[in-house]
Amino acid sequence: QESLSCDASGVCDGRSRSFTSIPSGLTAAMKSLDLSFNKITYIGHGDLRACANLQVLMLKSSRINTIEGDAFYSLGSLEHLDLSDNHLSSLSSSWFGPLSSLKYLNLMGNPYQTLGVTSLFPNLTNLQTLRIGNVETFSEIRRIDFAGLTSLNELEIKALSLRNYQSQSLKSIRDIHHLTLHLSESAFLLEIFADILSSVRYLELRDTNLARFQFSPLPVDEVSSPMKKLAFRGSVLTDESFNELLKLLRYILELSEVEFDDCTLNGLGDFNPSESDVVSELGKVETVTIRRLHIPQFYLFYDLSTVYSLLEKVKRITVENSKVFLVPCSFSQHLKSLEFLDLSENLMVEEYLKNSACKGAWPSLQTLVLSQNHLRSMQKTGEILLTLKNLTSLDISRNTFHPMPDSCQWPEKMRFLNLSSTGIRVVKTCIPQTLEVLDVSNNNLDSFSLFLPRLQELYISRNKLKTLPDASLFPVLLVMKIRENAVSTFSKDQLGSFPKLETLEAGDNHFVCSCELLSFTMETPALAQILVDWPDSYLCDSPPRLHGHRLQDARPSVLECHQ
């Protein structure tokens, strides 16, 4: 049997050591003990008695099926306890009585059906994070379960086999910053929603089939809900159930953010909310985020005209990796308040983007992200976006463009352009002179000779440049990142010629440690202020004698330098 490894600060690692019991020889010097992924099965009353100063105890996935009632009696300083993914079929309040300092408790993934006969947590007055439940057996949430808990930062409940929810069970917790509910069906959703309205600021619903969700008015008085964010992850919706879900929003008037991740819409976007919902809901929602939305019939997807008015006040929309190939013109025109639009990892080509960025589209848009789409012509892209009079920031990275032409048109307010990972070999005057930030990293550039009078930040890492670009090209440059190129040297004159340069990141280049370079680095201790990752990323490539040495440490031979 292997032993624990402990460092000087009392952090002990015993993960995956095939322990069959809590190891002996534990001491009061231990602050953190990780015994996860072992075969411990049993924790006796004296096993941890020496650990009076233990703050962190991790016993994840250690096959524990029995814990004596007083096993944790000496752990008054314990702040973090992880008992997840074990074989505990029942939970005992006596375990937690002594743990008055506990801030984090994870009981998830154990095969209990309820949270014990009596309330488990009345003494845990400092608890901030609680994770409970499991996939198969946890079937009942009762009123006594959360007694004593008044405020939590995070509460996660995995109740995919929930068969009974006792009304008001969650109501006793007055303040929950982030509640994550794993529910397979929507059967108890309305009851739970009513109980958490006045306490939860961020509700996350996971793995829930909402296809049969039907709204009915909640039995609540006028309530001022603090809920600001609502997220659905791995949920299944239909056009009809989406309409029903919208009705919940009338109870959470402060909601500002809605998120859908990894959801499936078994529908066509033929939403038909009632008139009252259209008028009143989404009142303060400013941010809508959709990632990896699966629509089996996405070629038949509607233009969302039935919810246009719902979205008129939204300021930030992300629809990422969801097979979007066209945003209808009329939809774009209705997004009147939209300032930020991210359509990363979709299927947009310029010719269909033209339809989306039609006259009057996205009139307030400042930032557009079209990273990793199917754009092919920089010239066409710029031209199509001329309709966006307020666009200042454009990210068209990770598209594979044809060679850059000499001239292009761009929205006149554009200040930021991301062309990273686009396969470009040469930069030409197609790039607008108005830019303040340009990212051309991870391309095939072996030179950069473009005059950009307003440029403040240049990101040109992971290219093939052999020298720093000429400073006269960027009179107001503040930041240059040029790591992982083929730069062999830089000099006092070169750096001095960038009058405003505050940050230079030039590590991981192929430095030739000449007498000039080494004497410059030795004479200029202030390099540490300007060079990011100095000195560790600045290594000699040649001469062979100095290969792999840090520039800071390399010493030229007297003979070489005085010839």
Epitope: H294, Y299, F325, C329, E345, N355, H374, R398, T400
Partner: antibody, heavy 118, light 111 residues
């Protein structure tokens, strides 16, 4: 440059299965869909189905739904199409093609001839 | 399924003449202002080659004598001055509804 290279000709007996491959290069494989289209001798083109390598999602022509399976190996930038319960009417040239903009096929493989004969 | 009917079946032209190929869909292939109709050229023993997408957008690298037009259900491919290298089959294809379908083709030959 973008290339789709397909596996060689196949001669199969009725009732057998055939698995065709399509190796992609010159572009980010997971960013595009891969379609399969077939052309019987002297006939027009018939769409079989597509796959999006990024998430593995597929869609099929109902005529092939029960017999065709489309898969990918993203690490090898290769798409596969397996057709089972072959019959003589399946004798055709099978093409893979890259799907751009969600709607058009801008690069095609050279085609694989499948002959089904007893 | 959307049925695409191409006409004529064969088009026989002299070099320099204008070719007009037609494709009619059994229902509209419009998708919110964009016609999801493509045209492909196929020469004997070769795979099809994309010429036009979205009804009127000429694919990069395709000679500018090729143009596409139309909306709804009626689409046209024009070759302004036919050249010897333009012989082959021309297919239209819709991607408005699954299953995607191709027309039966028009054969272009030089007299």
């Amino acid at each position: 440059q973008v290339q789709l290279v397909q596996s060689g000709s196949e001669l199969k007996k009725p009732g057998a299965s055939v698995k065709l491959s399509c190796k992609a290069s010159g572009f980010t494989f997971t960013t595009y869909g891969i379609n399969w289209v077939r052309q019987a001798p002297g006939q027009g083109l018939e769409w079989i189905g597509w796959i999006y390598p990024r998430d593995g999602s597929t869609n099929f022509n109902e005529n092939f739904k029960d017999r065709a399976t489309i898969t990918v190996d993203t690490s090898a930038s290769t798409a596969y199409m397996e057709l089972s319960s072959l019959r003589s009417e399946d004798t055709a040239v099978y093409f893979c093609a890259r799907l751009t903009g969600g709607t058009f096929l801008d690069y095609w493989g050279q085609g694989t001839t499948v002959t089904v004969s007893s | 399924d959307i049925v695409l009917t191409q006409s004529p079946a064969t088009l026989s032209l002299s070099p320099g003449e204008r070719a007009t190929l037609s494709c009619r869909a059994s229902e509209s292939v419009e998708y919110y202002g964009t016609s999801l109709m493509q045209w492909y050229q196929q020469k004997p023993g070769q795979p099809p080659k994309l010429l036009i997408f979205g009804a009127s957008n000429v694919e990069s690298g395709v000679p500018d004598r090729f143009s596409g037009s139309g909306s709804g259900t009626d689409f046209t491919l024009k070759i302004s001055r036919v050249e010897a290298e333009d012989v082959g089959m021309y297919f239209c294809q819709q991607s408005r509804k699954l299953p995607w379908t191709f027309g039966g083709g028009t054969k272009v030959e030089i007299k």
